[in-house]
Amino acid sequence: SLLPVPYTEAASLSTGSTVTIKGRPLACFLNEPYLQVDFHTEMKEESDIVFHFQVCFGRRVVMNSREYGAWKQQVESKNMPFQDGQEFELSISVLPDKYQVMVNGQSSYTFDHRIKPEAVKMVQVWRDISLTKFNVSYLKR
Amino acid sequence: SLLPVPYTEAASLSTGSTVTIKGRPLACFLNEPYLQVDFHTEMKEESDIVFHFQVCFGRRVVMNSREYGAWKQQVESKNMPFQDGQEFELSISVLPDKYQVMVNGQSSYTFDHRIKPEAVKMVQVWRDISLTKFNVSYLKR
């Protein structure tokens, strides 16, 4: 069954945590649907964003942070492992120095920590996708 | 009650026709939700687009056409009559020489015809909105 989109869930992250998302683009890549995953510092959607991950399917991925309301330097990648019309599995792992983003089991993007992952309180998944799975796995202490 | 998004409906347009849309952005303007309305030449979403109207809420509006699979010259407007968090009513009227876009009863954008409006066979409304009304009024012959 489908999860609501935008999908919002409280989350606490630290080194070893992994966020897993399964979904499908709602339009063909010609029409440039988007997927966005935002790691927020508060439960409010207007809060700062520790890690912003936005896919324009078929074109590019941008990653950034929003600090005290201001977007910082954008990191862009043309790597496009997503397949037109196909379901994807996205996993974002918190490493000691960076986020590692896997697409369908393949390491596809990295983003160095700008803000501590421990500052994350909420994850939001939204834009032009249907969502079938969202999970945060916590490292056993 | 809410209409599904993306929302697709068969439509025939000509001078005097008006497409009316009521909806609400799914996110605060700080997060830059989008609204897109596309007038297609076929019932398929990959078909050409006679009139492409895309709002990046709080930032800008772009209008364009997609002809034989290629995007043409984009028209951009910074006019932003949409209100953060508020419902909007959008009406797109087919005039003899152009489309006239009204937002909450106020004339806000125009786009000169590049392709005959009679070429339109389908309208799609999508991206980051909830949709409560979609209507095409046909000119009585």
Epitope: A70, K72, P96, D97, D112, K116, A119 | -
Partner: antibody, heavy 122, light 107 residues
């Protein structure tokens, strides 16, 4: 092993522009994810961050010095440079270049040059 | 004036534990780094990402942070640890600030 060496005129007149260059050996300044910073230290005082340039060429400056600061790079010579305009005697300091992994706020600055003293005086 | 506040001086007996604090940062959000500097020399990174030690830095150096205070701890201070110590953090991820420095004396 990455080496850095600052070079610049030891004496600059007030109101002129101070220029210092850092030559990097043992690794390209365009190699990700490193960034390259300028820090200064007035005699007998603490450290002050001036700005940095990322491996992609993006620049970031201290708000207090931004209006007078420009950091650029010469990739062919593997150098990056600092220009500080409209100097006063308060700009007298040892100027250091340093390397950091990605953003210096996250990883700190792990390799420093020896520093070059620039005196502003007429 | 610095956005990060350090005590100007700290004394420790040889072999004892020294703690140098750094206050005023948003350490719940931004990492802190620590440097040591001896007269006439360039600073040397001793701690990054709050508590990580670069290779070659002795294990007696450790770091921690909580709220608006970060702490550099030197367990079993040695004579060669006598130096100036600076904390460094971010006002944002692209705006760096240093503390005013702490002179550590090993008695």
């Amino acid at each position: 092993q990455v080496q850095r060496q600052e070079s610049g005129p030891g004496l600059v007149k007030p109101s002129q522009t101070l220029s210092v260059t850092c030559t990097v050996s043992g690794g390209s300044i365009t190699t990700g994810p490193y960034s390259w910073s300028w820090i200064r230290q007035p005699p007998g005082k603490g450290l002050e961050w001036i700005g940095y340039i990322g491996y992609s060429g993006s620049t970031y400056y201290s708000p207090s010095l931004k209006s007078r600061t420009s950091i650029s790079r010469d990739t062919s010579n593997n150098q990056f440079s600092l220009q500080l305009s409209s100097v006063t005697p308060e700009d007298t300091a040892v100027y250091y270049c340093a390397r950091s992994r990605s953003s210096p706020t996250t990883f700190g600055m792990d390799y420093w040059g020896k520093g070059t003293l620039v005196t502003v005086s007429s | 004036s610095s956005a990060l506040t350090q005590p100007s001086a700290v004394s420790v007996s040889l072999g004892q534990t020294a703690r140098i604090t750094c206050q005023g940062g948003d350490f719940g959000r931004y990492y802190v780094a620590w440097y040591t500097q001896k007269p006439g020399q360039a600073p040397v990174l001793v701690i990054y990402q709050d508590s990580e030690r670069p290779s070659g830095i002795p294990e007696r150096f450790s770091g921690s942070s909580s709220g608006d205070t970060a702490t550099l701890t030197i367990s079993g201070a040695q004579a060669e640890d006598e130096a100036e110590y600076y904390c460094q953090s971010g006002i944002s991820s692209d705006n760096i600030v240093f503390g005013g420095g702490t002179h550590l004396t090993v008695l």
